[in-house]
């Protein structure tokens, strides 16, 4: 038998226990107040920086893009899709008309000055949303020229020129000196491309990927 | 409401229920002690030495790492 | 990391918590109760076997990995 | 060589048209390039009135919008200006310029101008 | 459109001596910009285009420089056909302007 402990010392014996117990219970809740803590301003410190992000994002874009026009992308509150304010937007593009009138190399050096490229038309549905926009005595620079002049016509942004998604008037191409592409309205055929001196001043359609902040 | 103010909702739950408990369990445990205490006062002495093996457990728990 | 995935790390961290939590302080309250039928049964020995029982206890707390 | 000759009478009166022709040799104004008139007011100020291109398209200076017209006849390699409602303010010389050269960048051929005085 | 400001208005130098004549743009023109001379009672004639590069034939005295706005011409060693009338022109986006020009005579 060991010896009996005297009450004092079992008090006391209990009193370590409790202190011991609840310095476990403390440092439980900080830890667990240390993780909730956590997962409530690391979030918010994240949104910050995501926010940070997104003005530095912007600020590039503000030189040539003072006002953007945002729509939400999904349910997501986090993505945020934008167009340049005066620009309009189609699937994941925005497309911008510019009325001034240079030659087509102005014209591509025009839209790159704003981030974009002369218009790469992949689509019917994409030529359709475009021509909802333009005027029908007026001629609009595409991003589809042939620089050799040897008919091998290729887009600004190096996607593959694909005979089949062309939309051609009739007769068109008709001309070797002719390097560069128009989109223009004629009575018979109503909307198509034609080629034409890359020299002459037309106006032009700008397009440009989303922005997303 | 979106997806990730449903996980915030949720952690602030845990959270909750996570003190709670801890609370719950400090309290019984101590409960269970006094109620030792007293079993020792009443009968001769079976818990002699209980102390001591306590003592380890605790030696053991305080030097488990804090969750990173 | 991404803002949702810490979200969702750290609910695991405390669901994991709250779940360990919650089966030591069952498994107490069964030690309890257990214990007050024994000292019912026989009030010359409240508590026999307790001692065991507690360090299996903390045998299981000891062993349990950190939260990462 | 490119050669561009301007033509037309040298007094307008006031509130008549004024016409100009522009006889290109050299090229033929349909295969290329766009063709312009430009004028210089007696300050020595010059003004880019506005062209038609190889394609027939035509510009015209928004300021002269409602009073210009530029034509061509591609069989006689020539193209026209009319402008109507004149006053004395349009008293210039008219020169037709081709434009197009240098990818743009510069009118290397003009005429060697006429004389247009606007006066009652 | 883009307004086109040239200075100074009149130059006066002699034989030899060196000039420059400046253009202001008042838009961006991506280096599109042109000078002409122009002699008494003769069309203008092309000197530079695309800011620095020399029209054909003309004398390697004649340079151009500039970017964004700001553009000049320089010419060294004046000789005495380079007298006469000097303008710049931008050809970035039509209409393209003049600019008021500059009168350079022998002093």
């Known amino acids: 038998m060991v010896p009996e402990e005297e009450p004092q010392d079992r008090e006391k014996g209990l009193w370590w226990f409790q202190l011991k117990v609840w310095s476990m219970a403390v440092v439980s809740i900080l830890l667990l107040s240390v993780c909730f803590t956590v997962s409530s301003v690391v979030p918010h410190n994240f949104m910050y920086s995501k926010t940070v992000k997104r003005l530095s994002k912007l600020r590039e874009y503000q030189q040539y893009h003072p006002s953007l026009t945002c729509v939400m992308e999904g349910k997501d509150i986090e993505d945020w899709s934008c167009c340049p304010t005066p620009w309009t937007s189609f699937q994941s593009s925005c497309y911008f008309i510019s009325t001034g009138m240079q030659s087509w190399t102005k014209s591509q050096k025009n839209c790159s000055v704003m981030g974009a490229d002369l218009v790469v038309i992949n689509t019917r549905e994409e030529q359709d949303f475009i021509i909802q926009n333009l005027k029908r005595n007026s001629s609009y620079f595409l991003g589809l020229s042939d620089p050799g002049g040897r008919r091998h016509w290729q887009w600004v942004d190096q996607t593959p020129y694909n005979e089949n998604v062309t939309f051609w008037h009739s007769g068109e191409p008709n001309n070797l000196d002719e390097r560069c592409a128009i989109i223009n309205f004629r009575s018979s055929e109503e909307w198509g491309w034609n080629d034409i001196h890359c020299h002459v001043p037309q106006k032009s359609i700008c397009k440009m990927k989303k922005i997303y902040i | 409401l979106g997806e990730p103010q449903l996980c915030y909702i949720l952690d602030a739950i845990l959270f909750l229920y996570g003190i709670v408990l801890t609370l719950l369990y400090c309290r019984l445990k101590i409960q269970v002690r006094k109620a030792a205490i007293t079993s020792y006062e009443k009968s001769d002495g079976v818990y002699t030495g209980l102390s001591t093996r306590n003592q380890e457990t605790y030696e053991t728990l305080k030097h488990e790492k804090p969750p990173q | 990391l991404g803002e949702p995935q810490l979200c969702y790390i750290l609910d695991a961290i405390l669901f994991l918590y709250g779940i360990v939590l919650t089966l030591l302080y069952c498994r107490l309250k069964i030690q309890v109760r257990k214990a007050a039928i024994t000292s019912y049964e026989k009030s010359d020995g409240v508590y026999t076997g307790l001692s065991t029982r507690n360090q299996e206890t903390y045998e299981t707390l000891k062993h349990e990995k950190p939260p990462q | 060589d490119v050669q561009l000759q301007e033509s037309g009478p040298g007094l307008v009166k006031p509130s008549q048209s004024l016409s100009l022709t522009c006889s290109v040799t050299g090229y033929s104004i349909s295969s290329g390039y766009y063709w312009n008139w430009i004028r210089q007011f007696p300050g020595n100020k010059l003004e880019c009135m506005g062209y038609i291109s190889y394609d027939g398209s035509n510009y015209y200076n928004p300021s002269l919008k409602n009073r210009i017209s530029i034509t061509r006849d591609t069989s006689k390699n020539q193209f026209f200006l009319s402008l109507n409602s004149v006053t004395t303010e349009d008293t210039a010389t008219y020169f037709c310029?081709?434009?197009?050269?240098?990818?743009?960048?510069?009118?290397?051929?003009w005429g060697q101008g006429t004389l247009v005085t606007v006066s009652a | 459109d883009i307004q086109m400001t040239q200075s100074p208005a009149s130059l006066s130098a002699s034989v030899g001596e060196t000039v420059t004549i400046t253009c202001r743009a008042s838009g961006n023109i991506h280096n599109y910009l042109a000078w002409y001379q122009q002699k008494q009672g003769k069309s203008p004639q092309l000197l530079v285009y695309?800011?620095?590069t020399l029209a054909d034939g003309v004398p390697s005295r004649f340079s151009g420089s500039g970017s964004e706005t700001q553009y000049s011409l320089k010419i060294n060693s004046l000789q005495p056909e380079d007298f006469g009338n000097y303008f710049c022109?931008?050809?970035?986006?039509?209409?393209?302007?003049f600019g008021g020009g500059t009168k350079l005579e022998i002093k």
């Open positions: 310029v081709r434009g197009g050269d240098y990818d743009d960048g510069g009118f290397a051929y």
């Open positions: 695309n800011a620095k």
């Open positions: 022109q931008h050809f970035w986006i039509i209409p393209y302007t």
